[in-house]
Amino acid sequence: MAVTACQGLGFVVSLIGIAGIIAATCMDQWSTQDLYNNPVTAVFNYQGLWRSCVRESSGFTECRGYFTLLGLPAMLQAVRALMIVGIVLGAIGLLVSIFALKCIRIGSMEDSAKANMTLTSGIMFIVSGLCAIAGVSVFANMLVTNFWMSTANMYTGMGGMVQTVQTRYTFGAALFVGWVAGGLTLIGGVMMCIACRGLAPEETNYKAVSYHASGHSVAYKPGGFKASTGFGSNTKNKKIYDGGARTEDEVQSYPSKHDYV
């Protein structure tokens, strides 16, 4: 019962986590304009992994996709890759874990197979969560670096008279969603791995008992059908093709590759 609960809870937590990772990846608020020096700005900038947006005084928000792929900073590309890998692994993990759930009966699937699948999905969730946490952390580190760099040369005098305030960016909501979601996926994965230990049948070592018949002797050994606990034995190698991980490069080219954070 406890195993089923642990497995079920692990699945639900991972499901929420992966939904969060997907949400964070799609969100536009990875970095938002820092309002410390201009709290009354009528033009508010925020940026995501795929596009940058500007909310104007009219209330209208204009978003433009990063049209270029090669012109984008390598770090942004790395974050995109980490998030997509996290989503793909998480999605496969969810698919595997559905079939691994103890409460779902599929044909005559043995507990050993379910244990294998539970461990596989658990590992996938752990890696997925780590990918998301890593991606968000890399982006956050990039923001912190750029924030202090822009603070250092924040004011550039124009003839000593006019001040031009450089736009600085700070942590957006997507970062917090990503961290929490990555953490949940990681916790869900750990729970699945714990559940896997309970699913794997213990080896029963009964002593052989001999029954002597009057004519000839026949030996019957109980416990002869020993369940396999080797996790590698039942898994087949599947080739995964992900054709969906493409960027939505639309509208217009992004102004400057140095400007996105």
Epitope: Q33, N38, V40, T41, A42, V43, N45, Q47, S52, V54, E56, S57, S58, G59, F60, E62, R64, M158, V162, Q163, T164, V165, Q166, T167, P255, S256, D259
Partner: antibody, heavy 115, light 113 residues
């Protein structure tokens, strides 16, 4: 087409309040903020504040802070601007402004403050 | 608050003339997020509401004749009318659309010579 129709002219005594309405049509009312701008005779245009019809969020010019209140009735696609503690220098034409780039202006409401 | 200063305050010209008026802001109106300058130009005729001519410092509003053009970046902006028409005699205002409170210039009154 997009249109903003404002209420009629008002004559008020100093210390009184005035409430000007602005009925919007031809676009989705909640899509854009509604701004209020006034123009005293022979003076430059002066921004008073705005309201976000989606959530009722407002921002006011500090010059009018505490005296101006902007509200909306989304069901009627109407915005209201109330100015209290009127003084003679509040005599002006009051405009509501909306849509992208603040392109659409109401016809203006003349408010005269006189004892 | 951002101060907007327009010059000249009044200008006399004839039909067919090319006229230029300037607007200076006390702070930059350039937004690095989308590489736009948040300066707007309006035309106002006596007893009428202002009419949007140009936004983003240089983009003409639809329906505005091509003789109107805007230029400039950062803090210095210009509105040019290439060939004055009788209906162009009015007061022109520039507006900061970058920071609250939104502020307007004192206006340039264009009169018939």
């Amino acid at each position: 087409q997009v249109q903003l129709v404002q209420s009629g002219a008002e004559v008020k005594k100093p210390g009184a309040s005035v409430k000007v309405s602005c009925k919007a049509s031809g676009y989705t009312f909640t899509d854009y903020n509604m701004h209020w701008v006034r123009q005293a005779p022979g003076q430059r245009l002066e921004w008073m504040g705005y309201i976000n019809p989606n959530n009722g969020g407002t921002s006011y010019n500090q010059k009018f802070q505490g005296r101006v209140t902007i509200t909306v009735d989304t069901s009627a696609s109407t915005a209201y601007m109330e100015l209290s503690s009127l003084r003679s220098e509040d005599t002006a034409v009051y405009y509501c402004v909306t849509t992208r780039y603040l392109a659409v202006w109401g016809q203006g409401t003349t408010v005269t403050v006189s004892s | 608050d951002i101060q907007m200063t327009q010059s000249p305050s009044s200008l006399s010209a004839s039909v067919g003339d090319r006229v230029t008026m300037t607007c200076k802001s006390s702070q930059s109106l350039f937004n690095s997020g989308n590489q736009k300058n948040y300066l707007t130009w309006y035309q106002q005729k006596p007893g009428k509401a202002p009419k949007l001519l140009i936004y983003w410092a240089s983009t003409r509003e639809s329906g505005v004749p091509s003789r109107f053009s805007g230029s400039g970046s950062g803090t210095d902006f210009t509105l040019t009318i290439s060939s004055l028409q009788p209906e162009d005699f009015a007061t022109y205002y520039c507006q900061n659309d970058y920071s609250y409170p939104l502020t307007f210039g004192g206006g340039t009154k264009l009169e018939i010579k």
